[in-house]
């Protein structure tokens, strides 16, 4: 299970991935319009220090659909 | 327990290219993040880059234009190649593993292997 | 120069408390990233310490100590050994480099 400001790494963060992601599929490196993060991505953000939920859906490949 | 060995040739010459293979036992190399680092000789530890399986890299960014990283998940293997080297390459090359047990710290290490760039 | 600085030498009595600094800065130990510290001893490989700033992998003796505060970081050795001579290197990922960044090793000295 995953708990606020945990972090994830290796198969873990693949593996929370596609749970929170579901079928929208997941990047590690978000889009290029977010260029002045660099190479900063869900395995910097995750697995070197803690991150949320929130943080995690961001790397989705589609927004969540709203109910 | 996943173990680490690190292989290539021990001398490159000036503008070569350097490659080096680590071959991993005792663990699936698609299960965690696999870094390359090294060591001038009398100096400290500088990292090279580190990758996961999927394809996702990062390198650092003074050898960026010159490394290059890939994985035979066939062979449970991963390689740098470092392009266009120079007495400065010389080193101790390390590979290391993130297993994700330690928060993103290198928990697993190669012996080293040695290399010197020299005509 | 390194991106996180390290003392280069420090000693101590067996027996004695010493503590090994490492500085950063906002993009890297100050912006939450974890710092790990590895010891490595001549012709070896650095061997992981500690592990997400305060943590000990199995077989590290309790005496081996991390903490993080702000923008620093410290490994604290208790009971120093003749054994715990060696280098010492703190490792962070710093955002503004977009990459890992050790700190340039401090070495232990045991005196005696």
């Known amino acids: 299970a995953y708990g606020p400001g945990e972090t994830l790494c290796g198969g873990e963060l693949v593996d929370t991935l596609q749970f929170v992601c579901s079928d929208r599929g997941f990047y590690f490196s978000r889009p290029s319009s977010r260029a002045n993060r660099r190479s900063r991505g869900i395995v910097e953000e995750c697995c070197f220090r803690s991150c949320d939920l929130a943080l995690l859906e961001t790397y989705c490949a589609t927004p969540a659909k709203s109910e | 327990q996943v173990q680490l060995q690190e292989s290539g040739p021990g001398l490159v010459k000036p503008s070569e290219t350097l490659s080096l293979t680590c071959t991993v036992s005792?663990?699936?190399?698609?299960?965690?993040?696999w870094s390359w680092i090294r060591q001038p000789p009398g100096r400290g530890l500088e990292w090279i880059g580190y990758?996961?399986?999927?394809?996702?890299?990062n390198y650092n960014p003074s050898l960026k234009s010159r490394v290059t990283m890939s994985v035979d998940t066939s062979k449970n293997q991963f390689s740098l190649k470092l392009s266009s080297v120079t007495a400065a390459d010389t080193a101790v090359y390390y590979c290391a593993c993130i297993t994700g047990t330690t928060k993103g710290g290198m928990d697993v290490w190669g012996q080293g292997a040695t290399v010197t760039v020299s005509s | 120069q390194s991106v996180l600085t390290q003392a280069p030498s420090v000693s101590g009595a067996p027996g004695q408390r010493v503590t090994i600094s490492c500085t950063g800065r906002?993009?890297?130990?100050?912006?939450?990233?974890?710092v790990h510290w590895y010891q490595q001893f001549p012709g070896t490989a650095p061997k992981l310490l500690i592990y997400g700033n305060s943590n000990r992998p199995s077989g590290v003796p309790d005496r081996f100590s991390g903490s993080k505060s702000g923008t620093s970081a410290s490994l604290a050795i208790t009971g120093l050994q003749a054994e715990d001579e060696a280098d010492y290197y703190c490792?962070?990922?710093?955002?503004?480099?977009?990459?890992?960044?050790f700190g340039g090793g401090t070495k232990l000295t045991v005196l005696g």
């Open positions: 990758f996961f399986y999927s394809g996702y890299t």
């Open positions: 906002s993009s890297n130990i100050g912006a939450g990233y974890d």
């Open positions: 490792q962070s990922y710093d955002s503004s480099l977009s990459g890992s960044v």
């Open positions: 005792g663990g699936s190399i698609s299960s965690y993040y």
